[in-house]
């Protein structure tokens, strides 16, 4: 902490400007009014302060707002956000998507830090649910964001937000997460026609039950093997050879290359050899 010392004559800051970069830490502490800093936070980012100087500015804001910064200050924190701890951020009440975007921009290109995770958590909890605009914003900055949420957290995602999800956003989701997301996607895309529906729902099919896969097999969807490999084992096992053949269409030949891998291996093992032979792929149950 910086010791309390009187501001030297003529050094009292009247505005936040570049002259302050020449101030020593104790001078910043003594000569910069916290209220002035709060009202001119937008200028801080344009000034090349050292990390040590930023520590002093943060300290001044902490003294002015011991219960947490107001959103008018938070929105203009810029690089000072990197100095915040998760404990600091837990005191904030961030409601504006613009504020969230401004702070995520500061951390852009880096992995999600504990500070960012706390900020997002505060924001989403404040909104009560992950609406489409928020999800759009978060997945734009962090494509893996959706899959970092627990199944419980994902349950607060409204079906309307699913439209914002891109296939790559689901790359790291595990089966339990897809179990939660699939019914929402099914609801979101229910009014689309067959081929368009399949294009949209495909990324979510890792959460689909057997009856939905049976229904898809009647629609000439030609599911690729990569999607088939991500299906739930319990959903695949009850499918007949005929149903899998219809589901995969021309891709059925790909089963041979995956015959030693789950869930294909588990499915093959539970089929009658006579039925497998109808595929002409040499699969052994």
């Amino acid at each position: 902490e910086v010791e309390k010392t009187a501001c030297p004559s003529g050094k009292k800051a009247r505005e936040i400007d570049e002259s302050l970069i020449f101030y020593k830490k104790w001078e910043l502490e003594a000569c910069v009014d916290a209220a002035l800093l709060a009202t001119q936070m937008d200028r801080v980012n344009a000034i090349p302060f050292t990390y040590e100087q930023l520590d002093v500015l943060k300290h001044k804001l902490d003294e002015l707002y011991p219960q947490g910064y107001p959103e008018s200050v938070i929105q203009h924190l810029g690089y000072l956000f990197l100095k915040m701890s998760p404990e600091d951020i837990r005191k904030w009440n961030v409601t504006s998507l613009e504020t969230l975007k401004a702070l995520l921009e500061v951390n852009k290109g880096h992995e999600m830090s504990p500070q960012v995770a706390t900020l997002i958590d505060r924001f989403v909890k404040g909104r009560g649910q992950l609406d489409k605009d928020t999800l759009d914003t978060l997945t734009a900055f962090y494509p893996g964001y959706l899959c970092s949420l627990s199944p419980e957290e994902l349950s607060s995602v409204p079906p309307s937000s699913i439209w914002a999800v891109r296939p790559q956003d689901l790359d790291t989701c595990d089966p339990r997460q897809l179990d939660v997301l699939y019914p929402k996607a099914r609801l979101a895309f229910q009014n689309m026609n067959g081929s368009e529906y399949f294009v949209k729902i495909q990324s979510f099919l890792g959460g689909a039950p057997t009856e939905d896969l049976k229904a898809l097999s009647q629609q000439n969807v030609s599911m690729d093997l990569a999607t088939f490999m991500k299906l739930r084992t319990d959903a695949v096992l009850p499918l007949t050879v005929a149903e899998v053949q219809k589901l995969l269409g021309p891709h059925v030949e790909g089963l041979k290359a995956e015959e030693r891998h789950r869930p294909v291996r588990d499915w093959i093992l539970r089929q009658r050899q006579d039925d497998l032979d109808t595929l002409g792929l040499g699969l052994q149950g």
Epitope: D174, P175, K230, D234, L237, R260, R262, R265, L269, R270
Partner: antibody
Framework: QVQLQESGPGLVKPSETLSLTCTVS??????????WSWIRQPPGKGLEWIGY???????NYNPSLKSRVTISVDTSKNQFSLKLSSVTAADTAVYYC???????????WGQGTMVTVSS | DIQMTQSPSSLSASVGDRVTITCRAS??????LNWYQQKPGKAPKLLIY???SLQSGVPSRFSGSGSGTDFTLTISSLQPEDFATYYC?????????FGGGTKVEIK
């Protein structure tokens, strides 16, 4: 609840065939969801999967042991068995039988039986 | 065959510590990864299946994460009964390989 019990000789001579049986109680070896595996663990070493069998008789073996392993199932006795031919001292291990549930993993194990290969 | 590499091979920790064990597959195995605990003279016990699902009856201090090639087993607060050897295993490929094991010892 399902329990597994291994049985068989504890001492086998080199070049002979090791034979073990696993008896399933409290459940059926003809379960749709389960395969039945043999796994071994040499003294002070890690686990090595030997192979599995499904009640239909379909088998799958560890490639490194495939030429010497035979696993069979007897649904009427609710048992499955392991035969490992041409044994050497390197086959000395604790041999476990285990249930492999398709949705979970090796969720039920026998207590293990020590088999020593020595003349 | 898919190779499974566990690290560390052994570690010393105290009761109450947070312990993390990692397992790496030589190729992608999706979420098909199981974790087992084995105590001396006993058969292994299934802790986690499908990378992150807790087996029935296993304390919630155990958790698993990961997908693809990199996986983690975490014990949030080590208890006296947790000192044991832990193995990862992949059921994705028909070779069913185990990791080499991680022995968790008392510091």
């Amino acid at each position: 609840q399902v329990q597994l019990q291994e049985s068989g000789p504890g001492l086998v001579k080199p070049s002979e065939t090791l034979s073990l049986t696993c008896t399933v109680s409290g459940g059926s070896v003809s379960s749709f969801t389960d395969t039945w595996s043999w796994i071994r663990q040499p003294p002070g070493k890690g686990l090595e999967w030997i192979g599995y069998i499904y009640y239909s008789g379909s088998t799958n073996y560890n490639p490194s042991l495939k030429s010497r392993v035979t696993i069979s199932v007897d649904t009427s006795k609710n048992q499955f068995s392991l035969k490992l031919s041409s044994v050497t001292a390197a086959d000395t291990a604790v041999y476990y039988c285990a249930r492999d549930n398709v949705f979970t993993g090796f969720d039920i194990w026998g207590q293990g039986t020590m088999v020593t290969v020595s003349s | 065959d898919i190779q499974m590499t566990q690290s560390p091979s052994s570690l010393s920790a105290s009761v109450g510590d947070r312990v993390t064990i990692t397992c790496r597959a030589s190729q992608s195995i999706s979420s098909y990864l199981n974790w087992y605990q084995q105590k001396p003279g006993k058969a292994p016990k299934l802790l986690i299946y499908a990378a992150s699902s807790l087996q029935s009856g296993v304390p919630s201090r155990f958790s698993g994460s990961g997908s693809g090639t990199d996986f983690t087993l975490t014990i949030s607060s080590l208890q006296p009964e947790d000192f044991a050897t832990y193995y990862c295993q992949q059921p994705y490929d028909a070779s069913y390989t185990f990791g080499g094991g991680t022995k968790v010892e008392i510091k």
